[in-house]
Each structure stands twice: as C-alpha cells, then as structure tokens.
Interface confidence: low
C-alpha cells in the first residue's frame, strides 16, 4: 500500500490496532522490513507499507484526520471530499475526522445530503455500520452533539466556534463520498441548531448534547422541525433529568404555528404539545447550576409525525345562515391543573385560521375543522336571543327552543345552549312548554338525565334563578313574568342519543304580575319535589311565585313541607303562603315569618300554592321545599 499526503493538506493518517480480538496469530504493519503496530503519516509524507497477515481488517483501524482552520484565513466551504480516496486506502475499518476551528462569531453549518441522519442513543449501533459522530466546542471544552446513522430526518446541524465531524466506515463499505458539505452562517448565539426534515409520516428520536451525560450549564440548544402542512407532529419526552438550579429555570420553549403566545414555555415535566401543523421549533434552555451539587440536565425525546388523527382532516359545515342573533363558541373546557400543559387543541375556520377559541355568528355558513388530539377537551357554548319588540306582533307567537341539527352533528360536546328571551316590559310575559314534562332538580330527587334546562331571569339587576329542570317529571309548563334565559346544559356525551328528548316551546302571552307560575300535573305514585326559586340564596324580596297543581278525579294529593318553619325573618312587609282549592276557592293563609308550616295536607281537587316574600333580613332567607304525592282515592279522607 502507498499513502501519499500532499503538503499543506492538513491531513494526518493514523493506522493503529483496533479493539483486541482473541485471534491466535498477531499481525503487524511492515515498513522497511520493520514490524510495527502503529503508523502515523503526516502532510507531505509518502509511505509504502504492507501487512504481515491476510486479514488486517481484523486487527487494525485507520483514522484520517483533516484540520480545517477558519481562524487565520478563508474557510474551504462546500462539499467535503474523502481524502485520500477510499480506493487508495487499505481495507480497514476507517474513520474520517474533520476538525473545523472558527471564531465564536462564525456559525458553521453541516448540510447532509439524502439520506439524512438519524440520531442514536448510547449502546445503539447503525445497521450498516456507518456512523457520524458530531461534536462542538465551548471555549476549550468539547461537547458531543450526538451520534447518527443514515436514513433519518436530520438535514442540517449549525454550530459556532468549531465542529468536529467523524465519519466511521466499516472496511467492507463501498462508500466513497462524505455525504455532507460545510457552509458558513452568521452567529447562532447558542450551542447548536439541529434541523430535522420530515417528507412524510415518521418519527425521530433526538437527544440533548452530551446525552446521557449532562447538558452544558446555562446553554441553549434548538431543534427545528420541517413538517409538511398536511401532517401533524407530536412531541413526547422519553427520558429527562433536571439539574439543581441556582439561577434561572430549566425549560423547553416552542415556536408553534397558530399560537398567539410564542414562544410557549414549558417545564420538562409538563405534557408536551401534540398534533401541531406545520414547521415548529423546540429549544432546551439550561440554568446556572449549584456549584456544590450541580446534578445533570439531559433530555431524550421523540417527535412523531403522522396524518391527522380522527377529526383533524374532516370539514364540518355549520349552517347558521338561517339563524338570527346567535353566536356559537367552541372553546377549551376549563382544566383543573392549569400549570400542566396539554397538547395543542385548535379549531380551524376554512382549515386555515386555527385558534383555541372560535366564535361563529349567525347569518353565514361556516366550514370548520379540528386540529386536536382529543376533542373531549373542547366544548361548545351557544347563545341565541329571541326578542319581541312589538307586543302586537308577538302575542301568542311561539318559538321552538331546539338545538339546530348542524350543531348536534359537530364532534364537539355541547355544553350550554342559551336562549335569551326578551319581552317588552309590562306588556308581555312568557310561557315555556316542554315536549316532555319536566322534573325540578332537588337534592332529594336529583336529575340524572344527560341534560337540563336552567331557567333564570335575564334582567341584569334581578338575581332570580328559577331552577334546573330535566325531562321526565310532572311540570307541564312554566310561566314567567319577564325576560329570562333558558340554558340547555348537557352533562354527558349521551346527550347526542337523548337529543330527541329536548324540545321546549316558548310563547309570548299577555303580561301577568307574578314572577313565575309552575303548572304541575303529577303522575300517580310518583313523588314530585318542588322548591322555591333561588334555592340556597333565598327567594328575592317582594317576589311572588305560584304552583298550579292538578289532581285527577280519582286521586288524592298529599302536600308535604320539609321544614317546620320557613326560617324567614322580615325586615319590612310580610311573607305569606296561600293554599287555595281551585274548585271551591277555599283558601288557607299562612304567615311564613310567624307561623309554623302546615302539616301534610290532603287535596281531592286541583289546588294552588302561592308563596310571596317580604323584604327579609340578610341571612334569614325564604327557601321552601315541598312535595306532592298522588294516591288512588280509595277511601274518603275528608
């Protein structure tokens, strides 16, 4: 063999024994009849040698190191050549090393032609035996950026101050090109930037510098991911350790497309973003470590790029073109642990503008899609106003309070659908008639349906909540004096299946003075629980409500109050209750602030319960709970 190195080439060739094998027969380099085990050839030298055995590859390795000095003169940028050519070298396992030294202000970029590189961890090896070991430099300290195989996603690595690249080729490998080029860049102001390019679906495992040892103190390392727009990327941390910080905090920062809060900063222990569309950056920032007990910062993570999951590539049409005074908001559900980050979850309009909240308004048709790993993290809130400005036009008019089918077909759970029902003051009132009779939610008989109607006053100054009502009870209708909001609130995904049970009609009726009237038609053998509005806060001052309770001809109703006294203490006025038989008009009047509440009473005919409040003293509110039970009229209880 003959190796001749040109003058000024800054190349050194070293042939030395490799890892010792248990081969019985030793092997030597033979030069001028001398038997040696190591040979060094420098620039300008020409040496002829041979080996004393037939399979020198089992004994020796060759290292070819080229020093590139960018400090004193111009850098030889461009495609890097294998020098000397592999055809001139003995067939030994060979390592080509390029050691580039540059000023701190100079950025150096290694560009890898296809196939790109795949980073491997400690203990891993490359299938074809070809490995790329890349190191950087911080002052005099060498920092290992990583070891890489072929057939990956890493296309470029940018560093500053210097780079050492070692390409290891097995003796049998035919490769005769370096596969990379060097370019100069402006200062990157960090340890390194690794660019990872995905052409299609795939994954990449990447590691912090020096992994599995500690990341250099107070350093910054960035990974840039290039992802086709039609694919989605998710990041998961496979392994990490935190050091003991004296100043600053160790963290990762993301530049995420569509995020209004770039950079997004997370702790390493947080859940990392998922389902990101398009290119994004991830940076690892170290801290100033405790000198006595520094610990180590290290990170191994995976980026998974795949086609959009589930709903992400579906377009949904939300047709609000025939709606008026309506807005639909899709937004994140409130999460308990606000410090924990969860993967990105976006809703997109026309598949282009994506955000975590989206409000659609009536009068248009909207095309939306979702960019979210888990759609249960979103919900919908809808508001619709039905107002009557002219009582002559509205009286006796009816509107169906039904969730439009377009909304039910969306893959996001409906949380609230609120109808604001507005009437001209002192001119009209409202009546709500459900498709299925309603049950009032009480502690004694809670609703267990997938949705309820929450009925409350919509007059800003009035704090009046009539209650929560669900299908399957005895309340036939609810009449209210003035503006109210009716909110259909869902409690379970099964609402989709039970949606047919929803159905409430509102009609504008002549004005009446009572705050509310509940029409109750109890079913036989079921106990109906009823309670005054504003339960737990007390019926508002000077408010009057009534219950119109029907008793079938062959039944008797038992009216039971659940307290001995109402508990109300009046500041001004009187609180009273009237129980009036509808047939005979006979009535009993009870002073709620003085009398005990009536014992259970039996009613053979339909009757009224009317409760009117005084102005109570604070803390002594009027809250009443009562029940009505029907039993067959077998004996004459009078």
């Amino acid at each position: 063999f003959e190796i001749a190195l040109p003058r000024e080439s800054n190349i050194t060739v070293l042939i030395k024994l490799g890892t010792p094998t248990l081969l019985a027969k030793p092997c030597y380099i033979v030069i001028s009849k001398r038997h040696i085990t190591m040979l060094s050839i420098k620039s300008g030298e020409r040496i002829v040698f041979t080996f004393s055995c037939q399979s020198p590859e089992n004994h020796f390795v060759i290292e070819i190191q080229k020093n590139i000095d960018c400090m004193s003169g111009p850098c030889p940028f461009g495609e890097v050549q294998l020098q000397p050519s592999t055809s001139l070298l003995p067939t030994l396992n060979r390592t080509f090393i390029w050691d580039v030294k540059a000023h701190k202000s100079i950025g150096l970029e290694l560009q890898f032609s296809i196939p790109r590189l795949r980073q491997i961890g400690p203990g891993e090896s490359c299938p074809d035996g070809v490995t790329h070991s890349i190191s950087g430099r911080i002052d005099a300290t060498v920092v290992r950026i990583g070891t890489f195989c072929s057939n990956g996603t890493v296309s470029r690595i940018k560093m500053q101050e210097g780079v050492k690249m070692a390409l290891h080729l097995p003796w049998f490998h035919p490769r005769n090109v370096s596969g990379f080029s060097i370019a100069n860049r402006s200062s990157i102001k960090r340890l390194c930037i690794i660019e990872s390019v995905f052409e299609g679906e795939g994954s990449a495992t990447l590691m912090s510098a020096n992994y599995p040892e500690g990341f250099p103190e107070d350093e910054l390392m960035t990974w840039q991911f290039v992802v086709p727009a039609h694919l989605r990327a998710s990041v998961s941390f496979l392994n990490f350790n935190l050091s003991n910080c004296e100043r600053k905090e160790e963290r990762v920062e993301y530049y995420i497309p569509g995020s209004t809060t770039n950079p997004e900063v997370f702790k390493l222990e947080d859940k990392q973003p998922g389902n990101m569309a398009g290119n994004f950056n991830l940076s690892l920032q170290g801290c100033d470590q405790d000198a006595q007990s520094p610990g180590i910062l290290r990170l191994q993570f995976q980026v998974l790029v795949q086609h959009p999951q589930n709903e992400s590539n579906k377009i949904y049409v939300v047709d609000l073109s025939n709606e008026r005074a309506m807005s639909l908001t899709i937004e994140p559900r409130p999460v308990k642990q606000s410090r924990k980050f969860v993967p990105g979850c976006f809703v997109c309009l026309e598949s282009r503008t994506c955000s975590s909240n989206l409000t659609l308004t009536s009068g248009s048709k909207h095309k939306i899609s979702f960019l979210c790993d888990d759609l249960t993290r979103l919900w919908m809130n809808v508001e619709k106003t039905i107002s009557c400005t002219d009582h002559r036009y509205c009286q006796r008019k009816s509107y169906s309070l039904q969730v439009p089918s377009d909304i039910l077909h969306l893959p996001v759970e409906l949380h609230d659908f609120s109808w604001k029902l507005l009437v001209p003051k002192d001119r009209l009132s409202l009546v709500l008639v459900p498709a299925q009779k309603l049950q009032q939610h009480t502690h004694e008989k809670p609703c267990n349906t997938s949705f309820s109607y929450l009925v409350a006053s919509a007059i800003p100054s009035q704090d009046l909540y009539f209650g929560s009502f669900c299908p399957g009870g005895s309340i036939k209708q609810i009449q209210v004096k003035q503006n109210i909001s009716v909110t259909l609130r869902t409690f379970a995904p099964s609402f989709q299946q039970e949606a047919s049970r929803q159905g409430l009609t509102v009609s504008f009726i002549p004005y009446f003075k009572e705050e509310g009237v509940f029409t109750v038609t109890p079913d036989t053998k079921s106990k109906v629980y009823l309670r005054t509005p504003n339960w737990d806060r007390g019926l508002p001052s000077l408010t009057s409500v009534s219950w119109n309770i029907s008793v079938p001809r062959d039944q008797v109703a038992c009216l039971t109050f659940f307290k001995e006294r109402s508990g109300v203490v009046c500041q001004t006025g009187r609180a009273f209750m009237i129980i009036q038989e509808q047939r005979t008009r006979a009535e009993e009047i009870f002073s709620l602030d003085e009398d005990v509440l009536p014992k259970p009473s039996f009613h053979h005919h339909s009757f009224w319960v009317n409760i009117s409040n005084c102005s109570p003293t604070s803390g002594k509110q009027l809250d009443l709970l009562f029940s009505v039970t029907l039993t067959p009229r077998t004996v004459d209880l009078t």
């Epitope: 025939n322 089918s405 299946q497 047919s500």
Partner: antibody
Framework: QVQLQQSGSELKKPGESVKLSCKAS????????MHWVRQAPGQGLKWMGW????????TYADDFKGRFVFSLDTSVSMAYLQISSLKSEDTAVYYC????????????WGQGTLVTVSS | EIVLTQSPATLSLSPGERATLSCRAS??????LHWYQQKSGQSPRLLIK???QSISGIPARFSGSGSGSDFTLTISSVEPEDFAVYYC?????????FGQGTKLEIK
C-alpha cells in the same frame, strides 16, 4: 369500491306504506351522512333530507315532514326510507346518496327505487 | 329557501362544440354550488363541487366557474356521451335545492 344498492321497485295502493332500503358497501356507513332525493316522473331532483349516520338523527325538508321517516341499521350498513299513507303524488324514483363528511355534495348515489302509487 | 334557475332549459349542440350551462341563485350562496349529470334511466353523477373544484374520474373537459349567485358549467368540447340532463345544487343552507335542469341534446 363504494356502492349504494337500493331495493327493487314497489307498486302500492294509496294509503299503504312502503319501506325502501339502501345498502352501503365499500366504506363504513357511519363515516358519511346519507341523503334521500326524490325524482318524480319527467321531473327534476328534490332533496328530501338526510340522516346523521353516527347519531341516527334525521333532518327533513319541509315538504317531507310527517309521512317520511329515515332510519338506519348500522350493524348491516343499511339506511331506510319509510313512507306511510302513500298518495299518488308520491310516485317517483327515490335515491339514496352519500354526503361527504357532512359536506352536502353527493359523491355516490344508489341506482334508485321506483315507487308507483296507483289504485 | 334558495331557488336555483338553470338556463337554457334545452341546449342543442353537435359533438365537438362548446357547451355553456348557466345556474342562477335567488341569493348569494358563495361557492356552495355543485353540478351533477344525469343520463336517461341512470342516477345522477357528481361533476363539479364548490362551483369550480374538479372531481376525480371526471373528464377534464368539464369545468365550473362562478361565485355568489351566478354559476357556469362548461364542457369545452362536447362528446357523444355528454348528452344528458345537468343539474346544479345549492348546499348553502337547508333545504338543499336543485335547479330544474338543463337538457343537453344532439343537434
């Protein structure tokens, strides 16, 4: 390949009922909405409504509320159209058609079922 | 509801000629308009979606244009198999409606 196979022609008397079927194959029924379209003899196409194949919720056009019912049996990938109290003006070809991702254009159609109502 | 008016009701052309079919909506429907072809005794077939988007498997001689309330279906050079009835369909809001159709017949 995607196919919508509809049941055969029906001859009915006024006042009777009929149930038409549409079998979906080559795709998962619940991934796409199913629409029904009517075409009276020598006339144009009239959209009757659609059924959400995931939830089973039907939506009817105003002219088809009352006597027309859309239903599904997802276990056998079938969609059905039932018409009760048939009238002579119900004589038409009834098509089932697949809606793309709730996006109302119909990329696949059944071959149609002719319903003739005559005394 | 959206009313779609197609014109002409009948279009008589010879093979090789250019066909221009019009569809006008009673109000602006953006690009929510689709075109279908129906041959005698057959089911309709989707030709163009969203006014101008081509459909896989449909010959390139079929193209659509328009937005708002005026739409056009163009057949650049009519082939013998193109003689059929063509319907436009609005997908803007419930109920979805079809035009009354344009019959393309051999001259």
């Amino acid at each position: 390949q995607v196919q919508l196979q509809q049941s055969g022609s029906e001859l009915k008397k006024p006042g009777e009922s009929v149930k038409l079927s549409c079998k979906a194959s080559g795709y998962t029924l619940t991934d796409f909405s199913m629409h029904w379209v009517r075409q009276a003899p020598g006339q144009g196409l009239k959209w009757m409504g659609w059924i959400n194949t995931e939830t089973g919720a039907p939506t009817y056009a105003d002219d088809f509320k009352g006597r027309f019912v859309f239903s599904l049996d997802t276990s056998v990938s079938m969609a059905y159209l039932q018409i009760s109290s048939l009238k002579s003006e119900d004589t038409a070809v009834y098509y089932c058609s697949r809606g793309r991702d709730y996006d109302p254009h119909f990329d696949y159609w059944g071959q149609g079922t002719l319903v003739t109502v005559s005394s | 509801e959206i009313v779609l008016t197609q014109s002409p009701a009948t279009l008589s052309l010879s093979p090789g000629e250019r066909a221009t079919l019009s569809c006008r909506a009673s109000q602006s429907i953006s690009d929510f308009l689709h075109w279908y072809q129906q041959k005698s005794g057959q089911s309709p077939r989707l030709l163009i979606k969203y006014a101008s988007q081509s459909i896989s498997g449909i010959p390139a001689r079929f193209s659509g244009s328009g937005s708002g309330s005026d739409f056009t279906l163009t057949i650049s050079s009519v082939e013998p198999e193109d003689f059929a009835v063509y319907y436009c369909q609005s997908a803007h809001s419930f109920p979805y409606t079809f035009g009354q159709g344009t019959k393309l017949e051999i001259k």
